[in-house]
C-alpha cells in the first residue's frame, strides 16, 4: 500500500490486522483492501448452498469509516444477485445503515458472513433490498460467475477456493464456528498479569471447546440437536491467529504490522488459563493485585503520552 497511514490510528491497526487474517481466500469468502486505499475493500462471497443463490459468486465493496471499528462499514454489492440492489449501500444490522446495532468486536469477516447468512432472507422492503423470483435469482447466480471487477481486477471464477465436497460442514456450522471464534467472550489475564484483549489476540476466548462435530439426534421427523456438557474439557485455550501468506505478497507496512503482532504473541504464554474456582479469601488478594497492576498500567500510559508529546520529532514508522 503506497499511501502513508498513521500506524497509531486504531482503525489502521485494526484494518491491517484484518487484512492479514483475510489474506488467504476460503471456499466461501474473501476480502482484501484496494492497493491504494486501506479504507476501501473488495469482497467476494459464495451464495449460500440450498438456496436460490447456490452456485453464485458475488462481488462487492466495503467502505470503512475513519472511526472503524467504532462505527460500521458500508456494504455495496457490485454483482447482480436479486436480493441486494447493485451499487447501493445495503441495509443490514451490521452495516452503516444501523450504527446503533453495530458492535466494535464485529469485523469484516462478520460482515461477510452476515451477507451470506442474510441472502436467503426476505428483503421486506428494506433499503437496498430486492425480492426477485427464485428463477431470476438462480439465473443471476449462474451469470455471476462471469463477472470481472474493474476496480480490483478480480475474476469471480478464480477468487474463492473450490468448494470442498462431502465432508464440508453445513452453512450453519460454518457460521457458528466463525461466530464462536471471532467474538471475544472475555478478556483473559495471563500469568504476568497482562490483560489480553481482543485487540491483542483476535482468537482468544474463554470457551469450553466441545467437539466440532457432534452427531445430530433425530427425534421422529424433528431435527433436534441437543448436547450435554458433562464430559467437556474445562480449560480455556488460545487459538493462534491464522497463518498469513508469505511476506513476499505483503506490503512493507503489512509485513511490519504482522511482525509486531507476532512479537507480541511470542511474549504471551501458549495457554491462557481459564478462571479457576476460588474461595472468598483469595478473591480479595486477587482484587488488590489487579488494582495495583491497573494503576501501574495507567501510570505507564500517562508517562508514555507525556513522552510522545515531548518527543514527537521521533514519530516515524516503526
Amino acid at each position: 500500500m503506497e499511501t502513508r497511514y498513521n500506524l497509531k490510528s486504531p482503525a489502521v491497526k485494526r484494518l491491517m490486522k484484518e487484512a492479514a487474517e483475510l489474506k488467504d481466500p476460503t471456499d466461501h469468502y474473501h476480502a482484501q483492501p484496494l492497493e491504494d486505499n486501506l479504507f476501501e475493500w473488495h469482497f467476494t462471497v459464495r451464495g449460500p448452498p440450498d438456496s436460490d443463490f447456490d452456485g453464485g459468486v458475488y462481488h462487492g465493496r466495503i467502505v470503512l469509516p475513519p472511526e472503524y471499528p467504532m462505527k460500521p462499514p458500508s456494504i455495496i454489492l457490485l454483482t447482480a444477485n436479486g436480493r441486494f440492489e447493485v451499487g447501493k449501500k445495503i441495509c443490514l444490522s451490521i452495516s452503516g445503515h444501523h450504527p446503533e446495532t453495530w458492535q466494535p468486536s464485529w469485523s469484516i469477516r462478520t460482515a461477510l458472513l452476515a451477507i451470506i447468512g442474510f441472502m436467503p432472507t426476505k428483503g421486506e422492503g428494506a433499503i437496498g433490498s430486492l425480492d426477485y423470483t427464485p428463477e431470476e435469482r438462480r439465473a443471476l447466480a449462474k451469470k455471476s460467475q462471469d463477472f470481472c471487477c474493474e476496480g480490483c481486477g478480480s475474476a469471480m471464477k478464480d477468487v474463492l477456493l473450490p468448494l470442498k465436497s462431502g465432508s464440508d460442514s453445513s452453512q450453519a456450522d460454518q457460521e457458528a464456528k466463525e461466530l464462536a471464534r471471532q467474538i471475544s467472550f472475555k478478556a483473559e489475564v495471563n500469568s504476568s498479569g497482562k490483560t489480553i484483549s481482543e485487540s491483542d489476540l483476535n482468537h482468544s476466548f474463554s470457551l469450553t471447546d466441545l467437539q466440532d462435530d457432534i452427531p445430530t439426534t433425530f427425534q421422529g421427523a424433528t431435527a433436534s440437536t441437543s448436547y450435554g456438557l458433562q464430559n467437556s474439557s474445562a480449560a480455556s485455550f488460545h487459538q493462534p491467529t491464522q497463518p498469513v501468506a508469505k511476506n513476499t505478497s505483503m506490503s512493507p507496512r503489512q509485513r511490519r504490522a504482522q511482525q509486531q503482532s507476532q512479537r507480541r504473541l511470542s511474549t504471551s504464554p501458549d495457554v491462557i488459563q481459564g478462571h479457576q474456582p476460588r474461595d472468598n479469601h483469595t478473591d480479595h488478594g486477587g482484587s488488590a493485585v489487579l488494582i495495583v497492576i491497573l494503576t501501574l498500567a495507567l501510570a505507564a500510559l500517562i508517562f508514555r503520552r507525556i513522552y510522545l508529546a515531548n518527543e514527537y520529532i521521533f514519530d516515524f514508522e516503526l
Epitope: L113, E124, S169, L179, T225
Partner: nanobody, 111 residues
Framework: QVQLQESGGGLVQPGGSLRLSCAAS????????MAWYRQAPGKERELIAV??????KLAESVKGRFTISRDNAKSTVYLQMNNLKPEDTAVYYC??????WGQGTQVTVSS
C-alpha cells in the same frame, strides 16, 4: 423480516432451573447459526452459547450448567439453564449469526 422472540425468563432461586426459548421467523432457520447472549446490569453483552447444525460452543462461565439445543421443525432455539447462580442474573438475548437480535428476556436469580 427476521424476527426473534425470546421467552421463559423470570425470577428463580439460586440452584434453580429455567428453560429459555427463542422462536425465529423470516429466514431459513436450519441454515443459520443461532446464539444466546446475556447482558448483566452495567456490563457488556457477553456471548454464552452458539449452535450450528452439529456444532456447539459454550462460554466457560456456563460450562456444565447450561445446554443449548435447536428444533429446526419449530424454528426454535433453546437454552436450558440449571444450577443457576446470582451472577447469572441478566437480560438474555437470542441472536441469528450474531447480527440479528431479539428483544431479550430478563432472568433474575435471587433468594
Amino acid at each position: 423480516q427476521v424476527q426473534l422472540q425470546e421467552s421463559g425468563g423470570g425470577l428463580v432461586q439460586p440452584g434453580g432451573s429455567l428453560r429459555l426459548s427463542c422462536a425465529a421467523s423470516g429466514f431459513v432457520f436450519e441454515n443459520s447459526a443461532m446464539a444466546w447472549y446475556r447482558q448483566a446490569p452495567g456490563k457488556e453483552r457477553e456471548l454464552i452459547a452458539v449452535i450450528g447444525t452439529t456444532f456447539i460452543k459454550l462460554a466457560e462461565s456456563v460450562k456444565g450448567r447450561f445446554t443449548i439445543s435447536r428444533d429446526n421443525a419449530k424454528s426454535t432455539v433453546y437454552l436450558q439453564m440449571n444450577n443457576l447462580k446470582p451472577e447469572d442474573t441478566a437480560v438474555y438475548y437470542c441472536s441469528k449469526s450474531g447480527a440479528y437480535w431479539g428483544q431479550g428476556t430478563q432472568v433474575t436469580v435471587s433468594s
